[in-house]
């Protein structure tokens, strides 16, 4: 697994440099979340071919998968800074089960899936310092995120590796987009 | 890293229009992000544009939103910069550069490949 951001070999070696600020912080979490997505990517392309099939035929899916529109104020078009961090960390907040549901999924990134899950927690305690209106934050019921889970660990293995292979990439378009947006804050 | 060209350049009245691209031979372009900036005699480089991985998600500098329009034809590995009502400040050396995180963003040091750059001269 990728060494956690701020634990690198240039960090050690340099140790008169500035520290980082919270949003730099921030991007060099989400980048670190980015680097782990593409490497089980990697795993999950190489073992299926769930890759080339087309956007289109994978977004008929069940799946209700966090993803930013343009009413949560994270694109140009309406860019508002408070509505679109609550919509980041809710985002957050909602991938966390499908994380869950990743660990257990590969053979040989095993660990990889783990540091993206408890990254994304990392990352959720940062932006939770940022933002300022933490009441507007709906957390996810856990009685709804366990049936959830057990629902999908109960697909059959060709619908467990489509479930899979969407997660990976409905989690690495939802961070790009936030990544985007908070370099605009 | 990978490399890119851009092109498309030239004199161009005021109020006319050029279309400037940056291309790629790299594999795997259609995951990066892709920012145009540019630098006029004697100025800092500005940002001007850029595109995610998600085509959808594109930003604009205050200065240049609604004259430009950025696009990507993934097939061709090519991102495009489409630039309507120009005018004489827009003259400058206009450069792409691509981010590996599909991200893209306002700032220089979020790119990690850079052109060399194509002329656009604004005048008549």
């Known amino acids: 697994a990728p060494v956690p951001p701020g634990e690198d070999s240039k960090d050690v070696a340099a140790p008169h440099r500035q520290p980082l600020t919270s949003s730099e912080r921030i991007d060099k979490q989400i980048r670190y979340i980015l680097d782990g997505i593409s490497a089980l990517r990697k795993e999950t392309c190489n073992k299926s071919n769930m890759c080339e099939s087309s956007k289109e035929a994978l977004a008929e899916n069940n799946l209700n998968l966090p993803k930013m529109a343009e009413k949560d104020g994270c694109f140009q078009s309406g860019f508002n800074e408070e509505t679109c961090l609550v919509k980041i960390i809710t985002g957050l907040l909602e991938f966390e089960v499908y994380l869950e549901y990743l660990q257990n999924r590969f053979e040989s990134s095993e660990e990889q899936a783990r540091a993206v899950q408890m990254s994304t927690k990392v990352l959720i305690q940062f932006l939770q310092k940022k933002a300022k209106n933490l009441d507007a934050i709906t957390t996810p019921d856990p009685t709804t995120n366990a049936s959830l889970l057990t629902k999908l660990q109960a697909q059959n293995q060709w619908l467990q590796d489509m479930t899979t292979h969407l997660i990976l990439r409905s989690f690495k378009e939802f961070l790009q987009s936030s990544l985007r947006a908070l370099r605009q804050m | 890293q990978v490399q890119l060209v851009e092109s498309g350049g030239g004199l161009v009245q005021p109020g006319g229009s050029l279309k400037l691209s940056c291309t790629t031979s790299g594999r795997r372009f259609s995951e990066y992000a892709v920012g145009w900036f540019r630098q006029a005699p004697g100025k800092e480089r500005e940002f001007v544009a850029d595109i995610g991985e998600q085509a959808e998600n594109t930003w604009y500098a205050e200065s240049v939103l609604g004259r430009f329009t950025i696009s990507r034809d993934d097939a061709k590995n090519t991102v495009y910069l489409e630039m309507d009502g120009l005018k004489p400040e827009d003259t400058a050396v206009y450069y792409c550069?691509?981010?590996?995180?599909?991200?893209?963003?306002?700032?220089?040091?979020?790119?990690?490949?850079w052109g060399q750059g194509t002329q656009v001269t604004v005048s008549s």
């Open positions: 550069a691509a981010d590996k995180y599909g991200v893209g963003g306002n700032a220089q040091g979020y790119y990690d490949s």
